[in-house]
């Protein structure tokens, strides 16, 4: 049994880290492998993750890491029974992938303006709470080429756009994702999308 692609891990920097790797051949990850992880700290326990399959040879493990701080460093040991397949380490603060924003809502009754709001996925006492900025993706349900990204470079989880910038009488969808520039994070997954009908009508022109 051999590791083809070594585990790579990302952390949501609140309670969970996710590690993925590939084996040399088809593997029943949960039956054959265990990922042992331990905070490098004198009295920390050695916890263990039972991996799940991610494709025929791919494995994924979700590691519980509460109360994360910048200095936290974990040792990782991948075992097949009593055989150590791989040994490594992981510093959550250096591999941040934020949680996806939540509760995306579109308000269409704000005079010719669309108001999109969502919630920051972190509690106010978390390090990432004030570090997140966002990207909003809006697209036409019937026309995949009619898609746009709005960068929300401020921290307030809202976006206002003129309804006139979208086609009238068309159903649109929106989704939002987050990143933390100061942590050099990757982008979060996209939030679930929300749908609305753009009923905006062009003002009647006088000649």
């Amino acid at each position: 049994m051999k590791v083809l692609q070594e585990p790579t891990c990302v952390s949501d920097y609140i309670s969970l880290s996710t590690c993925e790797w590939k084996m040399g051949g088809p593997t029943n990850c949960s039956a054959e492998l265990r990922l042992v992880y331990q905070l490098v700290f004198l009295i920390s326990e050695t916890n263990m993750c039972v991996p799940e399959n991610n494709g025929a040879a791919g494995c994924v493990c979700h590691l519980f890491m509460e109360d994360m701080v910048g200095a936290d460093n974990y040792t990782l040991d991948l075992w097949a029974g009593q055989q150590l397949l791989w040994k490594g380490s992981f510093k959550p603060s250096e591999h941040v992938k934020p949680k996806a924003p939540e509760n995306l809502t579109v308000y269409t009754n704000v005079s010719e303006t669309l108001l999109l709001t969502w919630s920051n996925p972190y509690p106010p006492d978390n390090y990432l709470y004030e570090k997140l900025t966002y990207a909003v993706n809006i697209w036409n349900e019937n026309d995949p080429t009619d898609s746009r990204i709005y960068d929300v470079t401020y921290q307030e989880p809202t976006l206002r756009i003129a309804a006139s910038t979208l086609k009238s009488g068309v159903s649109y969808r929106a989704r939002v994702r987050a990143w933390a520039q100061s942590y050099n994070s990757t982008w979060s997954e996209w939030s679930p999308s929300t749908k609305w009908y753009n009923a905006y009508k062009e003002p009647f022109e006088k000649h």
Epitope: I14, M48, M65, D67
Partner: antibody
Framework: EVQLVESGGGLVQPGGSLRLSCAAS?????????MCWVRQAPGKGLEWIGC?????????YYASWAKGRFTISRDNSKNTVYLQMNSLRAEDTAVYYC????????????????????WGQGTLVTVSS | IQMTQSPSSLSASVGDRVTITCQAS??????LAWYQQKPGKAPKLLIY???TLAYGVPSRFSGSGSGTDFTLTISSLQPEDFATYYC???????????FGTGTKVTVLG
Amino acid sequence: EVQLVESGGGLVQPGGSLRLSCAASGFSSSSAHYMCWVRQAPGKGLEWIGCIYAGSRGSTYYASWAKGRFTISRDNSKNTVYLQMNSLRAEDTAVYYCARAAFVNRGVSWIWPYYFSLWGQGTLVTVSS
Amino acid sequence: IQMTQSPSSLSASVGDRVTITCQASEDIESYLAWYQQKPGKAPKLLIYRASTLAYGVPSRFSGSGSGTDFTLTISSLQPEDFATYYCLGSSYSTGSNIFGTGTKVTVLG
């Protein structure tokens, strides 16, 4: 110093109730581990009662014999875990230990305790009339 | 899950090699720990994950086994090792933790 300190033990009449406390110091009680209770009757072996996950998912596990009469709870703001014992009987007389435990998890929803690494000094509960 | 520990007691001399066994009633992989307890004291963790030595535990203690059969070995018994030893098995199918009945190690003679 990292330690667990139990309190609340004492003499209680059969049928009575008692709440034991376990105060954690030197580490955050809300970090990634389980907090558990284990008891030992005089001259007998160790007996697991149950555990509560200290982090954001407060999942609990109990020994089958403890379900219903024994309840484990926590107050992370006080770094304290509790054991509420009801309908006490003479056979519940024991030293009650608080212990911190490692865990095994599968996915994000299945997480269970699997060994006790750090123990308190224990508190004696005597059930007698 | 049931944990059958044997022997229940044994007498030995300083320097002896001591072996204690623990048998689980179902496959518990390597979810087994060993503890040492002295009178009036809390148990002390010796071994976890069947064979991993806990921090600060002397190397004369070792553990082996997986599945249903496990062994704790003290390679050369020291005066401070006279105590009661317990195994602890964990079943993730039920989330339960069960201790063995204990093995009391006393001084021979």
